[in-house]
Interface confidence: medium
């Protein structure tokens, strides 16, 4: 089987504030199986902003249909975004277990907010 | 004005060892991810390396890894490419390419730098 | 990895005259899409990115549309300095990056 990869195409976008910012990840393969999650930053500090098994999340919504079996594309948007918005953020792929555990990551998005056009 | 200089290229044998240079210049070098690409004499154009702005992450092409590495010096504003174990298909022009900020296209590149690799 | 191919492989035509350059994916590549010309003796200079948009300096007679997987670079009326091979890059794809295998745009 092939081996998984995190595609995080875009190195960082730029959102005016209140506006909505789409963040693109797309998997390469469905194993192994288990959810996508994205975080804004890294390390012990990271915020979890979407979990595909969880919520709800009222600001993030998925671009496609992530409860169809053969989804591949977990791009998020994330609406009416404010400046504690900005970071980087990864999309990150869990692999199923009691806990659920940290397989693989993108390489990151860097999401800078611009003021709110006047 | 970006400029990029490529240099260290020449005529090697197989099996031989070389190592590529590029001087940048006309942007910020350190925060800018780089890649090296070629050109073999007739063909077309082959994504071979890139390394990040701090240099923590590199990538390869499966045709080279494990012979080359790419790497930088920033307080030079320099990246390089050592290349071991040298093939008769490595022969090709050698460029160094800056990545867009935003996306991974490539948005300068140097004029190149002649590898041929003859026994 | 994603696969490019372009056609033709060369274009014979004359000044004055309209190109058209197809480049297509073997899997979606959304509008991550760059075209490149380039020219012996000469850095390889970037067109188009994002399939449609010009990159700094380039005149408009050159256009690229298209989105997912095909993709067509337009040079509505050749002048001399055209003349030159032309590539598509891919860059949805994480590394390795890949290129088209080129379309050389020759006089006729």
């Known amino acids: 089987e092939e081996e998984l990869q995190i595609i995080q195409p875009d190195k960082s976008v730029s959102v005016a504030a209140g506006e909505s910012a789409i963040l693109h990840c797309t998997i390469t393969s469905l194993f192994p199986v288990g959810p996508i999650q994205w975080f804004r930053g890294a390390g012990p500090a990271r915020v979890l902003i979407y979990n595909q098994r969880q919520g709800p999340f009222p600001r993030v919504t998925t671009v496609s249909e992530t409860t169809k079996r053969e989804n591949m594309d977990f791009s998020i948007s994330i609406s009416n975004i404010t400046p504690a918005d900005a970071g980087t953020y990864y999309c990150i792929k869990f692999r199923k277990g009691s806990p659920d555990t940290e397989f693989k990551s993108g390489a990151g998005t860097e999401l800078s907010v611009r003021a709110k056009p006047s | 004005d970006v400029q990029l200089v490529e240099s260290g290229g020449g005529v090697v044998r197989p099996g031989e060892s070389l190592r590529l240079s590029c001087a940048a210049s006309g942007f910020t070098f350190s925060t800018s991810d780089m890649n090296w690409v070629r050109q073999a004499p007739g063909e077309g154009l082959e994504w071979v390396s890139l390394i990040s702005g701090s240099g923590e992450i590199t990538y390869y092409a499966d045709s080279v890894k494990g012979r080359f590495t790419i790497s930088r010096d920033n307080s030079k504003n320099t990246l390089y490419l050592q290349m071991n174990s040298l093939r008769a298909e490595d022969t090709a022009v050698y460029y160094c390419?800056?990545?867009?900020?935003?996306?991974?296209?490539?948005?300068?590149w140097g004029l190149g730098t002649l590898v041929t690799v003859s026994s | 990895e994603t696969v490019l191919t372009q056609s033709p492989g060369i274009l014979s035509l004359s000044p004055g005259e309209r190109a058209t350059l197809t480049c297509r994916a073997s899997?979606?590549?959304?509008?991550?899409l760059a075209w490149y010309q380039e020219k012996p003796g000469q850095a390889p200079r970037l067109l188009i990115y994002?399939?449609?948009s010009r990159a700094a300096g380039i005149p408009d007679r050159f256009s690229g549309s298209g989105s997912g997987t095909e993709f067509t670079l337009t040079i509505s009326s050749l002048q001399s300095e055209d003349f030159a091979v032309y590539y598509c890059q891919q860059y949805y794809d994480r590394p390795p990056l890949t290129f088209g295998g080129g379309t050389k745009v020759e006089i006729k």
């Open positions: 899997q979606s590549v959304y509008t991550y």
């Open positions: 994002g399939a449609s």
């Open positions: 390419a800056k990545e867009n900020d935003r996306y991974r296209f490539f948005d300068y």
